[in-house]
Interface confidence: low
């Protein structure tokens, strides 16, 4: 347990950690080893993890072997009604396991995000709840109607709609970012959000950008050909300049735009990318902000509620504001 | 770089109310608090409250409660304090501070302070 | 919440000075320090214990341990000379009476 004798490590690689866990050199400097969390034993081995303000309270100073990881005044948590503290790590459902750091809460998908296409074996995918379980599903309807599965279906894919695995290692901090968060608004200008920790603190915190689905003026039904029930993404028929609080884009863009369907399915993004705009606005003020371009939408039954947990959750409270 | 600007001395009679402006430029206003503090002359450094614009929350020292009034204004990106039933002890320059509750609560831009004098 | 600190601190040009700020289980909260020169508003040194904020000289270290948190100053000044207050959280803001550092 303590540090006197010579540094030996398993031989295996550096353990991985589960998500939100740093990954920490011990408290010898010999190994790296998962941090300790909230309320968990801690020695000068296994130390707690510093990245949520955590230390190793040993209580009487005679007793230096083994100690309870405690947090320190970082700012608590408010979520669902419950005050978290820093360093706490809980599950708000069996979607998402969450840790309040310093008054953010992040919170990672423990459920399978993906976006499954339409393919030849499965035309009309679906995410369903099963009884017992709490991840939602994809399940396949019986086609209905034989003549939408034709060669334009022929490129199944099963994918992360979000990129690569969030998750990744630099210099002793789990760098973890959320998946950017459906569109405030189905048309229109919105806004999307993630949480990260992808900074050279390895602090929490929320990060923006606009968006646009499609927009509101457009009537997109008008124009789903004869026979079909969607349009995944009309095609562009002029460029645009992107309106914002009275500010105009001071460029034009060819942007693509999600279309619509008429049997219940919705369209959404599918791959994004993020790109800086600059606005102009009538006082002759410039301001940049990123915004999320479209690069494909999918037509899916798994259609966005108003279910964005990052949304409500951001806002931070600190123990005075109990009273 | 933000740039907190507070409004000019005052001087007042006790038992009356005094309210200091406090307006942020050049940074994100409501996603901080704005925390006040008081120095008495000769004296350190006491807390008297803040305000989280983006919730509209406040909260008080306990030896303030009742007596201050912090308030703030998003469009303007000013906030505001108020002290009332002032008393000769309340003498001192008034400083706001932005109060950057993501790390723990830093104090990192002050305004320029505001001095208050309670007299007959 | 009570945090005390010595009322004065006097340090030779080039020596290390340290201001102690003692609190009942202080290693147990994080300790912001503050520099307050005469007729100026005061300016954050270190955050978190031991963070130095931008800008701020490495001269300026800060440590915490057990009921006592130190800010030392290295290499002292003569536009060190300023007083210094250590400030904790504890349901509010709480600050030490302060420490005049003099440097002759």
């Known amino acids: 347990q303590n540090c006197s004798g010579p540094c030996r490590c398993p031989d295996e690689p550096a353990p991985r950690c589960p998500a939100g866990v740093s990954l920490v050199l011990d408290g010898c400097g010999c190994c790296r080893v998962c941090a300790k969390q909230l309320g968990e034993l801690c020695t000068e081995r296994d130390p707690c993890d510093p990245h949520k303000g955590l230390f190793c309270h040993f209580g009487s100073p005679a007793n230096r072997k083994i100690g309870v990881c405690t947090a320190k005044d970082g700012a608590p948590c408010i979520f669902g009604g419950t005050v978290y503290r820093s360093g706490e790590s809980f599950q708000s459902s069996c979607k998402y396991q969450c840790t309040c750091l310093d008054g953010a809460v992040g919170c990672m998908p423990l459920c399978s995000m993906d976006v499954r296409l339409p393919s030849p074996d499965c035309p009309f995918p679906r995410r369903v709840k099963l009884p017992g379980k709490c991840c939602e599903e994809w399940v396949c309807d019986e086609p209905k109607d034989q003549t939408v599965v034709g060669p334009a279906l022929a490129a199944y894919r099963l994918e992360d709609t979000f990129g690569p695995d969030p998750t990744m290692i630099r210099a002793n901090c789990l760098v973890q970012t959320t998946e950017w968060s459906a569109c405030s608004k189905t048309c229109g200008m919105g806004i999307s959000t993630r949480v990260t920790n992808d900074n050279a603190s390895c602090r929490l915190e929320k990060q923006s950008r606009l968006c646009m689905v499609r927009p509101c003026e457009a009537d997109l039904e008008e124009n789903i050909k004869k026979g079909k029930k969607c349009i995944r993404t009309p095609k562009i028929s002029k460029p645009i300049k992107f309106e914002l609080s009275g500010c105009t884009s001071m460029k034009t863009y060819r942007a693509k735009f999600c279309g619509v369907c008429t049997d219940g399915r919705c369209c959404t993004p599918h791959r994004t990318t993020t790109l800086p705009v600059e606005f102009k606005c009538p006082d002759g003020e410039v301001m940049k902000k990123n915004m999320m371009f479209i690069k494909t939408c999918a037509c899916h039954y798994n259609c966005p509620g108003d279910n964005d947990i990052f949304e409500s959750l951001y806002y931070r409270k600190m123990y005075g504001d109990m009273a | 770089q933000m740039q907190l600007v507070q409004s000019g001395a005052e001087v007042k009679k006790p038992g009356s109310s005094v309210k200091v402006s406090c307006k942020a430029s050049?940074?994100?206003?409501?996603?901080?608090?704005i925390s006040w503090v008081r120095q008495a002359p000769g004296q350190g450094l006491e807390w008297v409250g803040r305000i989280i614009p983006i919730l509209g929350i406040a909260n008080y020292a306990q030896e303030f409660q009742g007596r201050v009034t912090i308030t703030a204004d998003k469009s303007t990106s000013t906030a505001y304090m108020e002290l009332s039933s002032l008393r000769s002890e309340d003498t001192a320059v008034y400083y706001c501070?932005?109060?950057?509750?993501?790390?723990?609560?830093?104090?990192?831009?002050w305004g320029q302070g505001t001095l208050v004098t309670v007299s007959s | 919440y009570v945090l005390t600190q010595p009322s004065s601190v006097t340090v030779s040009p080039g020596q290390t000075a340290r201001i102690t700020c003692s609190g009942d289980?202080?290693?147990?909260?994080?300790v912001r320090w503050l520099q307050q020169k005469p007729g100026q508003a005061p300016v954050l040194l270190i955050y978190k214990d031991s963070e130095r904020l931008s800008g701020i000289p490495e001269r300026f270290s800060g440590s915490n341990s057990g009921n006592m948190a130190t800010l030392t100053i290295s290499r002292a000044q003569a536009g060190d000379e300023a007083d210094y207050y250590c400030q904790v959280w504890d349901s509010s803001w709480v600050f030490g009476g302060g420490t005049e550092l003099t440097v002759l």
């Open positions: 289980l202080l290693a147990k909260k994080y």
């Open positions: 050049g940074g994100t206003f409501s996603s901080y608090a």
């Open positions: 501070a932005r109060d950057d509750i993501a790390v723990a609560g830093n104090f990192d831009y």
